[in-house]
Amino acid sequence: IWELKKDVYVVELDWYPDAPGEMVVLTCDTPEEDGITWTLDQSSEVLGSGKTLTIQVKEFGDAGQYTCHKGGEVLSHSLLLLHKKEDGIWSTDILKDQKEPKNKTFLRCEAKNYSGRFTCWWLTTISTDLTFSVKSSRGSSDPQGVTCGAATLSAERVRGDNKEYEYSVECQEDSACPAAEESLPIEVMVDAVHKLKYENYTSSFFIRDIIKPDPPKNLQLKPLKNSRQVEVSWEYPDTWSTPHSYFSLTFCVQVQGKSKREKKDRVFTDKTSATVICRKNASISVRAQDRYYSSSWSEWASVPCS
Amino acid sequence: RNLPVATPDPGMFPCLHHSQNLLRAVSNMLQKARQTLEFYPCTSEEIDHEDITKDKTSTVEACLPLELTKNESCLNSRETSFITNGSCLASRKTSFMMALCLSSIYEDLKMYQVEFKTMNAKLLMDPKRQIFLDQNMLAVIDELMQALNFNSETVPQKSSLEEPDFYKTKIKLCILLHAFRIRAVTIDRVMSYLNAS
């Protein structure tokens, strides 16, 4: 058993049918010695008396808020949560496996630049009695500071019969140098509590590996005289690290017809312009990627050919 | 000033071209190592990230873009001293900091070159003959060093009398390649920045 926060404790259980569970001793936080009784949640049934209460915690019915009283007055509370270990592996019931970029990905994180700021998000089908707490650091043995905000509900989607809820959090490394070469990964730890179930999820990454630039901005077309060709131009996104001559991007320019079946013409360039043939009803899209370290491509910025 | 880089004139700034070749070569070599050594811990998540140049050179600090010198987090240690007779920017006035930066890059390349050559000698003794260093990568390191053209004491190739542990050698190869790739990215960024300056 360990303390998650004041008066909230996590009991770790080897979870299988007929498991013996864990013996837990609760102590009433009071100078009083006599006349103390214990109850669980809203029930008035007295579970025991005395300054300590010994319980065998086996299943969720044994978890909850234990309260010690004296003469009708509440003395203190202890909330017991359960953390299930199933055949050596901690349960992952609360969050959905996003399966991207690989199986068992519960937390996904992205950064728009090298400033040390990043966003993580996760999915769940649970709508109520759910709380998250996020901590982060650079490295784990001698951790350096990363400050995270509160996790917030950022999107709701309907997936088949189920509603899916997306939560996200923003974090900022306390003293980040955009040009630094990372040797210790960022660690992100999310504590999730649903009713009386506790779970924790972790992700470990280098900022360089989670970079995804914003799409190029100010995408414009300039027709070339007496030609079907157009000059496409764009600019670096505002959120990208500066100076741009140091943090350079490379670009992919795509001409896509109305129908998805039509052949796509693609051009790769390090410049912020390109000359392409504009077909009727086609659209031109441009996306960006770090020129020197191949992390994710940005989303497409698009303009119609007409 | 901060315009994206057009394809450079190699005569104007030959190092940019060489640094791009270097990044391509080390990335290819790392990919080959990951595939060939699939049963070894060779992915970024599995290896320890070690920097053989730590406390010996300070490329990131010495090559910091002027725009980032205002960022206190980037100014851990900027007092380094290297030889200042680089010829990469033969056609321009070379500031002290720029020479310091380029000589730091040269020292990095020299250190990695020695490590890779020593390692290749061990890998050539492996009866499995599973993986060797790409000669193209070694040649590209050499070309960039020549383009930087710094005079510096030659570091003797390390020789080891004991029987090599091939498993450890292959894991060390992965660690070295990951670290060298990261340094090659920094070198490419620096060359691009200097080319645009």
Partner: antibody, heavy 115, light 112 residues
Framework: QVQLVESGGGVVQPGRSLRLSCAAS????????MHWVRQAPGKCLEWVAF????????YYADSVKGRFTISRDNSKNTLYLQMNSLRAEDTAVYYC????????WGQGTMVTVSS | QSVLTQPPSVSGAPGQRVTISCSGS????????VKWYQQLPGTAPKLLIY???QRPSGVPDRFSGSKSGTSASLAITGLQAEDEADYYC????????????FGCGTKVTVLG
């Protein structure tokens, strides 16, 4: 004590369907994940499928994906395996099993797919 | 073709010590715990070892398990006639959990 009893096995022609059941007793069935595991005559044990305690997630072996469906009825303390488009290579003893470090197995039910 | 590799058979005289190996990779045994089962002909598998080296109550201390890196092993000391059975190792893969990975079994023969 924990008890698992499989039923529903038998002889069936290729391409046909069969539904296996596993009746659970002696524990809070609705709190635990459950597996189906099979063993062809004289062959190795092969995992078939898993279902979470609340039925929210289901996982299948590639060899049965799209043909077999695992389900549970927690009000009846019963686990099911719906097997469609059966093939000769599905011939095996099918066991249900609890998920956990100390697991419990049923006695098995024989499924024979033969024309 | 099982992901976990076991020898097809091992044998020993009564009273002897035999060991069965089970080899996997970094993503399965290297990252997860190992179980061992005993299966007598015509019966369901019986759990012998869980969490690499733990014995459930009722399993004789002649059976012991261990794990090192990407391999595990089961040792039977003081071999007895009733130990003649098939023995299976089981683990998970970190990317496909909760799918069970089994070895293809080792037939233990008690000589004499």
């Amino acid at each position: 004590q924990v008890q698992l009893v499989e039923s529903g096995g038998g002889v069936v022609q290729p391409g046909r369907s069969l539904r296996l059941s596993c009746a659970a007793s002696g524990f809070t069935f609705s709190s635990y994940g459950m597996h189906w595991v099979r063993q062809a005559p004289g062959k190795c044990l092969e995992w078939v499928a898993f279902i979470r305690y609340d039925g929210s997630n289901k996982y299948y072996a590639d060899s049965v994906k799209g043909r077999f469906t695992i389900s549970r009825d927690n009000s009846k303390n019963t686990l099911y395996l719906q097997m469609n488009s059966l093939r000769a290579e599905d011939t095996a003893v099918y066991y249900c099993k609890t998920h956990g470090s100390h697991d419990n197995w049923g006695q098995g039910t024989m499924v024979t797919v033969s024309s | 073709q099982s992901v976990l590799t076991q020898p097809p058979s091992v044998s020993g005289a009564p009273g002897q010590r035999v060991t069965i190996s089970c080899s996997g990779s970094r993503s399965n045994i290297g990252s997860n715990t190992v179980k061992w089962y005993q299966q007598l002909p015509g019966t369901a598998p019986k759990l012998l070892i869980y969490y690499n080296d733990q014995r459930p109550s009722g399993v004789p201390d002649r059976f012991s398990g261990s794990k090192s890196g990407t391999s595990a092993s089961l040792a039977i000391t003081g071999l007895q006639a009733e130990d003649e059975a098939d023995y299976y190792c089981q683990s998970y893969d970190r990317y496909t959990h909760p799918a069970l990975l089994f070895g293809c079994g080792t037939k233990v023969t008690v000589l004499g």
